[in-house]
Interface confidence: low
């Protein structure tokens, strides 16, 4: 807490400017008045300040707005913003996707800081939901942004919020998330042309159940190592030896390389070996010929 | 059929405010942005923004921030042209056209309405 | 803001000649998805402006193949093979992929 004290004569503060800088904090406290602080938030970021000083300039502000700071001011705090709290920062009401920029853009190279989380928290519940440029901007700043929300907080994700999304965004999501957002790309990519379409879906497959991945193998699409050993167990076990050698088209050899590893070892195991062989690739495990194979969850279902 | 049915012309006087409606059919109105479109008599085509009528929210070009605002009826499908504090200037045809705004990547404005003129006069 | 500069501001042409309008950019326009947006529309008196080119070169359906659009970069051009009388009118350049989207000013096209 600064102590209260008069203002020295003639060092009252007009305008926010760089001759505040040689002002100690117990000056700054008593010859800045905290609304001419917030009117001039935009010129205190020009200005090096030190942390000490910052402490006080944000001791005025809290003053001025015990229940929170307007936008107006929110949109300007510039390196005052990294002085917040996320308790502080709960009290806001950020609405404007320009005040989230420029408080992201302060904070930018650096991790998600828990100010950050909060203020993204803050912004998105605000709007109702992550709408296309809102993601497009927090992508930009945080790529591993969508993986680090919930499934539930995905499924207020609008698909035309998932043109903003790039391969790399999606890196670190796991299963269940892809399981809501593949849906979601689905839907927004549905008018493209088949090449076209597969790139922009190809990095959220990983939700993809079986019958899309049968009706992309009839389209020619290549489908690379990588992108297969990250699509779901359950969606690739149904597939038959013709149509995995269809979606993978050239790179079906890989297959080989990959035959511990799941998928490609739960599939081996369920395809017969003798329509393995057709690959030519080596690949062992399959069922052998003259065996029966029985679907026991059809048998479940019937039971 | 597709299209975007306007509302009719208009006479205002300088202050006024008018209210242009673009009502759409034969197709799902929240898939398609709202875009308005300013044309001032013999003049060219000047693009105002955009309405995403998913989320609703609106974008403006530089020139019509402030007294223009885009709004939408969703339910109705139908989306609004409001100019505030008329002036001179404003007198045009204002046109509504959809285009795009994701799902493809072959965005462009289709389908236009046929325009409604706003005159204003004192 | 990306300023599209279209030239001539008027082509006279007579019928069945070839006509050839320009459209220059201040500034490439790719949007983040790898597509450029260049569309060109025609207003005929009166009427609403139609959709003729989508992404530079792409026809619209409906649209006469004596159309066509080329050009990369900051220069795009729109050529009609053979000008027929419903051809007339005024043609304008667009971009869409950089907001705020931008018009050319216009080319009128009449008869010489």
């Known amino acids: 807490e600064v102590e209260k004290t008069a203002c020295p004569s003639g060092k009252k503060a007009r305008e926010i400017d760089e001759s505040l800088i040689f002002y100690k904090k117990w000056e700054l406290e008593a010859c800045v008045d905290a609304a001419l602080l917030a009117t001039q938030m935009d010129r205190v970021n020009a200005i090096p300040f030190t942390y000490e000083q910052l402490d006080v300039l944000k001791h005025k502000l809290d003053e001025l707005y015990p229940q929170g700071y307007p936008e107006s001011v929110i949109q300007h705090l510039g390196y005052l913003f990294l002085k917040m709290s996320p308790e502080d920062i709960r009290k806001w009401n950020v609405t404007s996707l320009e005040t989230l920029k420029a408080l992201l853009e302060v904070n930018k190279g650096h991790e998600m800081s828990p100010q950050v989380a909060t203020l993204i928290d803050r912004f998105v519940k605000g709007r109702g939901q992550l709408d296309k440029d809102t993601l497009d901007t927090l992508t930009a700043f945080y790529p591993g942004y969508l993986c680090s929300l919930s499934p539930e907080e995905l499924s207020s994700v609008p698909p035309s919020s998932i043109w903003a999304v790039r391969p790399q965004d999606l890196d670190t999501c796991d299963p269940r998330q892809l399981d809501v957002l593949y849906p979601k790309a689905r839907l927004a990519f549905q008018n493209m042309n088949g090449s076209e379409y597969f790139v922009k879906i190809q990095s959220f497959l990983g939700g993809a159940p079986t019958e899309d991945l049968k009706a992309l193998s009839q389209q020619n699409v290549s489908m690379d190592l990588a992108t297969f050993m990250k699509l779901r167990t359950d969606a690739v076990l149904p597939l038959t030896v013709a149509e995995v050698q269809k979606l993978l088209g050239p790179h079906v050899e890989g297959l080989k390389a990959e035959e511990r590893h799941r998928p490609v070892r739960d599939w081996i195991l369920r395809q017969r070996q003798d329509d393995l062989d057709t690959l030519g690739l080596g690949l062992q495990g399959g069922i052998p010929n003259g065996y029966l194979v029985l679907d026991l969850s059809m048998q479940e279902a019937l039971s | 059929q597709i299209q975007l049915v306007q509302s009719g012309p208009e006479l205002k006087k300088p202050g006024e405010t008018v209210k242009i409606s673009c009502k759409a059919s034969?197709?799902?109105?929240?898939?398609?942005?709202m875009n308005w479109v300013k044309q001032a008599p013999g003049k060219g085509l000047k693009w105002m923004g955009w309405?995403?009528?998913?989320?609703?929210?609106?974008s403006y070009a530089d020139d019509f921030k402030g007294r223009f605002a885009f709004s939408l009826e969703t339910s109705a499908s139908t989306a609004y042209l409001q100019i505030n504090n008329l002036k001179n200037e404003d007198m045009a045809t204002y046109f509504c056209?959809?285009?795009?705004?994701?799902?493809?990547?072959?965005?462009?404005?289709?389908?236009w309405g046929a325009g409604t003129t706003v005159t204003v006069s004192s | 803001d990306v300023l599209m500069t279209q030239t001539p501001l008027s082509l006279p042409v007579s019928l069945g000649d070839q006509a050839s309008i320009s459209c220059r950019s201040s500034?490439?326009?790719?949007?983040?998805?790898?597509?450029?947006?260049l569309e060109w529309y025609l207003q005929k008196p009166g009427q609403s402006p139609k959709l003729l080119i989508y992404?530079?070169?792409n026809r619209f359906s409906g649209v006469p193949d004596r159309f066509s659009g080329s050009g990369s970069g900051t220069d795009f051009t729109l050529k009609i093979s053979r000008v027929e009388a419903e051809d007339l009118g005024f043609y304008y350049c667009?971009?869409?992929?950089?907001?705020?989207?931008?018009f050319g000013g216009g080319t009128k096209l009449e008869i010489k």
């Open positions: 056209a959809r285009r795009r705004d994701y799902g493809t990547s072959h965005w462009y404005l289709d389908v």
């Open positions: 500034q490439s326009f790719v949007h983040s998805n790898g597509n450029t947006y």
């Open positions: 309405i995403n009528t998913y989320t609703g929210e609106p």
């Open positions: 992404k530079v070169s």
């Open positions: 034969g197709y799902t109105f929240t898939h398609y942005g």
């Open positions: 667009f971009q869409g992929s950089h907001v705020p989207y931008t």
